[in-house]
Each structure stands twice: as structure tokens, then as C-alpha cells.
Interface confidence: low
């Protein structure tokens, strides 16, 4: 029953011209064109799409025109590689020209960049944007789709043009209003909040398909889905997971055009047989296409079905385990994950798969012994252990969260993960260190039934950004083996990693503790990152050092920005009592 | 799709010793386990050893100290020595492979041990 099986086309490009419409076109051409090339001119990349958008026309006109029955790895690859300055720019990206498809575009995909030596975006003057969005509407909303792309070469396409649209809103409400940074500022935030989120929520899902195949990102999706919508019947979700990972993995592969086009048929598909999905559907259909896709995703949990039998029956109970797991081990997996997910919303995904896991693993063991049903009978009694860890650790750091508060409940996750992972650079321990803290405000506020899953598949999401950060430049195997053995395990596996005995500490280098009258000048945000930045340092001089050691030079260094940023000469204060901080923190922590 | 070809097996006396290989192909980067399984004539399949990619390994009691399991990367080959062999470990073993579960299977090698 899948959605997506289309009568071939002469030309796929005129297809997916059709289907999509020049404005989507456009915008989809040349998010992907920046996800690849990540440091070309946004000039290039608009005279790149133009060129692409007037050929696609002429395919429209006559499908049997010349090179209009080439595929789009093929078209698209031709016109990324007419760039002029690709070797100087690129180096050995430029190889990937000399492929041939589908090699080719393997190629691209794997100089695709997670952390590009680009410049931090900074938010100019309210008036200065408006007067840009006023002068050229369709170029200011071209800049932003290609800023954020090439940022987050693996953002999902279509959810970036509901970013934009929501941008391009933005602006034209605001900038006629009477307080325009009023208006406009806290949108703006809201859209980077949660850009930056869906950025790593959707780089989880391509890391789950290409590190660990389809098989891991359909498991996923038979476990949220479920969960999602437990009144469907498993072959509804099974056909949903099926499209859903078309989907996923067009987008992580970069044809970001069938992409779109098959999300939408999705969308619409969910949509017309929504009495058989879901009864929280209703508001999102009623929507425009790309706010229907963006609610779909989002859409709460249906309520569970009432009259749910035990699972044991069918999973422990029953004398065919064993014959129905043989016969189709995936389609029995399937289900036991179908019906363990609807049964428990409370579940984080990653632990309802830890759970399948164990359960395949057992008949895997016990359908080989001489008496299966004696061996597997208590199999549910070894879901135990795996639920109760992330119930008992989502409880403590929940407490640590509400005694310290999110600023100084990220400093105690920074001391525990630099000492886990020392080798680990300062601004990925950081960078992730935070995030990680920000799951207490996140999830820590929800009731009991839904702190799991908000929690742990958000750690996951994380925990992901810190694979994907070191996987560019390996420094700890600690961390490889955590990210690379079970994706299911991941956050278990680094919760589990003590302090690394093996860590040589850091040389003592004042000057990385020396600070001036510019932190003073900076937003609170940034002022708090400086000084995390400096507690990493810290911890990584001196690993052993304790918590109270670590809280009082914490405090001095809090004391020492404060006095010398109400000082008259603030710069002379830092040189001065700088000296003095960097002395003390040496003798309070024996450096 | 992966594919996996067993190689290795034969007739091998009581005590004796034997390495199965098993060579993997196609979408391998994906592979976080590997494993060997093995039926003997009439009986149902047994878990022989486990490898996972960061290399740790599991094995039953029954194989334990006579097996090995081992994995070489670069040539996308898995290996098994095993040494001591009794006659109960006589059977077709199969190689497995999978990103969550083990879902691709080989065709199996014939090991007899026997005097």
C-alpha cells in the first residue's frame, strides 16, 4: 500500500518541477546545493538554482528534450561540479567530480560538514532587516534558507521551508508595527531555538540511518509511532514507518526534491484515512501543507486504546512463540515493539528498543534450548533492570536540577562529562554540556508519565551532536565506542563512563584563564559560556579535582567579573586581580 | 542488502581444530554485529559467538574457552576458530550480520567431527 509508487517519468526533473511548483523548486535547489557546497557565495549558489530552475522549464515544455531523461544526482551533480573554484575551496571534495553516480554523490555526502569553519550569523539592527526584507523580499528569504542550510547541512528540507514561511511572517507583521524589536526580536529567538532543535533532531534520524542502516531508523519509527498512535493497527503503522523512512532517507541522501514530494503525499495520505490513525489529527489536516506536515510531526499521543490485552499471551505465554518467530523474525519484532510502545507512552523510544532487543536476544537463545517455553517464561522480568535506570536517573538529576538551577546544573554535567572524556575539545564539551542541561527545564517540569520520554530521547538527540562533532575529528575512544556500538545504548554507555584514569592532565597556561574588560560587554548567555569554557580548562588541568575545590574557584572567578566590570578602569582590574585569580585557583586546586 | 558466504567447514577429528570464515558484502557499513549461529541435524539453531563492531564478544557456555570469535574490518571478513572440537559440534553454522538485529544470513558450512 505504499504511497509512493509512481508511474515512471521521462524526465524526473519536470516531475518534480510539477509536483512541487517553481517556489518550492527554487527553494529546495538550492538548500541543496548549500547543504554540499557549504562555502560557496550565496551570488553563486542564486546563479546556480537559475540556471538549474531554467533548464527544469524547458524539460516541462518537452519532457523528450536533451538531458531532460537525466536522473537528478546526475543534473545536479553536473552543475555543483561547473563550480570554478572547487579545488581551492574544497581540496579533495573536488575528487568527488572525477566519480561517476551514484559514487559521486556517496561523495558529496561524506564532505558534508557538521561543524564548517563558517562565521557565527549576527543579528544586525532591527531597521537595518527591515529596510533588507523591504527592498528585496525574495532575496532576503533566499539569504536565510541558504545561512541556515549550509550551517545544518543535514536540516530537513522540508521543514526548512516552514521555517522560512514562518520567517517571511515574521517581518511582514513586525516591521509594520509600532515597536518593531519588540515584535520581532522574541520570534526571532523562538525561530533559532527551535531551528537549532530540529537541526539535531533530524541529524539523529540521518546518523540512524546511515550508521546503523534502515533497520535502526524503522525500529525507531515503529516505536514512536506507536506510541504516537496506539489506536492503529500495526499494518497501518508498518506502512506509515515504510513511507516515513522513504522519506527520511531521500532527505539524509540529499534528493531533497522526491523528499518534499513524497512527504507531502505522506501528509496527505495521513490525512485521508486519519479514522484509522488518529483522533488527534483533525486540527492539523485542516492546515496549509506545510504547517499540516510540520503538526503531523509534532501531533500529541492519541489516547491508548481501553481494552488493551496483556502482552504476555502472545509474547511469553503462548506455545508458538517460538514457531511465529521463526517464520518471520521481523514481522514478530515488529509487533511485539508495536504493541510494547502503544501500551506505554511513558517509555522513551530508545528504552521500548532496548526492550525488543532483550526479547530478541532471549529467543534467539531459548528457541535453540530443549525446552524454549521454560527458558523464555520470565523474560519480561528482565525488562526489570532496563526500565527502572533511566526512571532512577532522570530522578536524580531532576533533584540536582531543581536544588542548582539550569546554569550551575550544566556546570556539574560539564565537570562530569570533561572527566569522562578530557580529550574531548573545550567547545564540543561545552557546546554539548549545555544542552545536555538544558533537559532539566525541558523535561524536568513534566509529570512523572511523560519525564522519560522527554528526557532520554532527548539526551539521545544530544549525545548524537557529540558523535557526529567528534567523528570529524577523533580524539577518545571512549567516545567512538559509545556512539558507534548500539545507538540504543548510547546514552547508558556514556552514563556508565567513569572518570578516565588514563587522561595525562593538561600543562597549566595562564593565559588561557586570562580575561578582559570585553566580557563585560556581552550577553549573559555569552558571559556563562566563557566561564563554562573556563571550567572545562579546569577540570582538564586538573581532573581530580573535587567538586568543592571546582565550586570555589567557580565562585572567585564570578566575583573577579563582577568587581572588575563595575571598576573605572576595567581593563587595568582584569590585568591586576586577574593575576590574582589565576594564583589562588592554582593553590586551591594544588596546580 | 548484505551478503555473507560461509567458508571453512569439513570433516575434522574429535580435539581437532577448524576456522570458518565468513566474507560480507554490500550495504556493510551499516553491520554493528556479527554472529554466529549453528544447527545441528534435527535440533533447533544455537547461538555460537557474538562480535559487535567496537569488537566485544559473547559466547555460551557450551563454546566458552574453545571458540574464538574475530573480525577483520578492512577485509569485511568474520572468523571462528575453534579448537577442541567434540562430536556434539557437528552442525551446518551460519553466519549473521545486522545494524539492531542480526537480519542477513549466510547459506551455512558443513562441520562434522568425527573419527
Known amino acids: 500500500r505504499g504511497v509512493f509508487r509512481r508511474d515512471a517519468h521521462k524526465s524526473e526533473v519536470a516531475h518534480r518541477f510539477k509536483d512541487l511548483g517553481e517556489e518550492n523548486f527554487k527553494a529546495l535547489v538550492l538548500i541543496a546545493f548549500a547543504q554540499y557546497l557549504q562555502q560557496c557565495p550565496f551570488e553563486d549558489h542564486v546563479k546556480l538554482v537559475n540556471e538549474v530552475t531554467e533548464f527544469a522549464k524547458t524539460c516541462v515544455a518537452d519532457e523528450s528534450a536533451e538531458n531532460c531523461d537525466k536522473s537528478l544526482h546526475t543534473l545536479f551533480g553536473d552543475k555543483l561540479c561547473t563550480v570554478a573554484t572547487l579545488r581551492e575551496t574544497y581540496g579533495e571534495m573536488a575528487d568527488c567530480c572525477a566519480k561517476q553516480e551514484p559514487e559521486r554523490n556517496e561523495c558529496f555526502l561524506q564532505h558534508k560538514d557538521d561543524n564548517p569553519n563558517l562565521p557565527r550569523l549576527v543579528r544586525p539592527e532591527v531597521d537595518v532587516m527591515c529596510t533588507a526584507f523591504h527592498d528585496n523580499e525574495e532575496t532576503f528569504l533566499k539569504k536565510y534558507l541558504y545561512e541556515i542550510a549550509r550551517r545544518h547541512p543535514y536540516f530537513y528540507a522540508p521543514e526548512l521551508l516552514f521555517f522560512a514561511k514562518r520567517y517571511k511572517a515574521a517581518f511582514t507583521e513586525c516591521c509594520q508595527a509600532a515597536d518593531k524589536a519588540a515584535c520581532l526580536l522574541p520570534k526571532l529567538d523562538e525561530l533559532r531555538d527551535e531551528g537549532k532543535a530540529s537541526s539535531a533532531k533530524q541529524r539523529l534520524k540521518c546518523a540512524s540511518l546511515q550508521k546503523f542502516g534502515e533497520r535502526a531508523f524503522k525500529a525507531w519509527a515503529v516505536a514512536r509511532l506507536s506510541q504516537r498512535f496506539p489506536k492503529a493497527e500495526f499494518a497501518e503503522v508498518s506502512k506509515l514507518v515504510t513511507d516515513l523512512t522513504k522519506v527520511h532517507t531521500e532527505c539524509c541522501h540529499g534528493d531533497l526534491l522526491e523528499c518534499a514530494d513524497d512527504r507531502a503525499d505522506l501528509a496527505k495520505y495521513i490525512c485521508e484515512n486519519q479514522d484509522s490513525i488518529s483522533s488527534k489529527l483533525k486540527e492539523c489536516c485542516e492546515k496549509p501543507l506545510l504547517e499540516k506536515s510540520h503538526c503531523i510531526a509534532e501531533v500529541e499521543n492519541d489516547e491508548m486504546p481501553a481494552d488493551l490485552p496483556s502482552l504476555a499471551a502472545d509474547f511469553v505465554e503462548s506455545k508458538d512463540v517460538c514457531k511465529n518467530y521463526a517464520e518471520a523474525k521481523d514481522v514478530f519484532l515488529g509487533m511485539f515493539l508495536y504493541e510494547y510502545a502503544r501500551r506505554h507512552p511513558d517509555y522513551s523510544v530508545v528504552l521500548l528498543l532496548r526492550l525488543a532487543k532483550t526479547y530478541e536476544t532471549t529467543l534467539e537463545k531459548c528457541c535453540a534450548a530443549a525446552d524454549p517455553h521454560e527458558c523464555y517464561a520470565k523474560v519480561f522480568d528482565e525488562f526489570k533492570p532496563l526500565v527502572e535506570e533511566p526512571q532512577n536517573l532522570i530522578k536524580q538529576n531532576c533533584e540536582l536540577f531543581e536544588q542548582l538551577g539550569e546554569y550551575k546544573f550544566q556546570n556539574a554535567l560539564l565537570v562530569r562529562y570533561t572527566k569522562k572524556v578530557p580529550q574531548v575539545s573545550t567547545p564540543t564539551l561545552v557546546e554539548v554540556s549545555r544542552n545536555l542541561g538544558k533537559v532539566g527545564s525541558k523535561c524536568c517540569k513534566h509529570p512523572e508519565a511523560k519525564r522519560m520520554p522527554c528526557a532520554e530521547d532527548y539526551l539521545s538527540v544530544v549525545l548524537n551532536q557529540l558523535c557526529v562533532l567528534h567523528e570529524k575529528t577523533p580524539v577518545s575512544d571512549r567516545v567512538t565506542k559509545c556512539c558507534t556500538e548500539s545507538l540504543v545504548n548510547r546514552r547508558p554507555c556514556f552514563s556508565a563512563l567513569e572518570v578516565d584514569e588514563t587522561y595525562v592532565p593538561k600543562e597549566f597556561n595562564a593565559e588561557t584563564f586570562t580575561f578582559h574588560a570585553d566580557i563585560c560587554t556581552l550577553s549573559e548567555k555569552e558571559r556563562q559560556i566563557k566561564k563554562q569554557t573556563a571550567l572545562v580548562e579546569l577540570v582538564k588541568h586538573k581532573p581530580k579535582a573535587t567538586k568543592e575545590q571546582l565550586k570555589a574557584v567557580m565562585d572567585d572567578f564570578a566575583a573577579f567579573v563582577e568587581k572588575c566590570c563595575k571598576a573605572d578602569d576595567k581593563e587595568t582590574c582584569f590585568a591586576e586581580e586577574g593575576k590574582k585569580l589565576v594564583a589562588a585557583s592554582q593553590a586551591a586546586l594544588g596546580l | 542488502e548484505v551478503q555473507l558466504v560461509e567458508s571453512g567447514g569439513g570433516l575434522v577429528q574429535p580435539g581437532g581444530s577448524l576456522r570458518l570464515s565468513c566474507a560480507a558484502s554490500g550495504s556493510i557499513e551499516s553491520i554493528n554485529r556479527m554472529a554466529w549461529y549453528r544447527q545441528a541435524p534435527g535440533k533447533g539453531l544455537e547461538f555460537v559467538s557474538r562480535i559487535s563492531k567496537g569488537g566485544s564478544t559473547n559466547y555460551p557456555d557450551s563454546v566458552k574457552g574453545r571458540f574464538t570469535i574475530s573480525r577483520d574490518n578492512s577485509k569485511n571478513t568474520l572468523y571462528l576458530q575453534m579448537n577442541s572440537l567434540r562430536a556434539e559440534d557437528t552442525a551446518v553454522y551460519y553466519c549473521?550480520?545486522?545494524?539492531?538485529?542480526?537480519?542477513?544470513w549466510g547459506q551455512g558450512t558443513l562441520v562434522t567431527v568425527s573419527s
Open positions: 549473521a550480520a545486522g545494524p539492531v538485529w542480526e537480519q542477513f
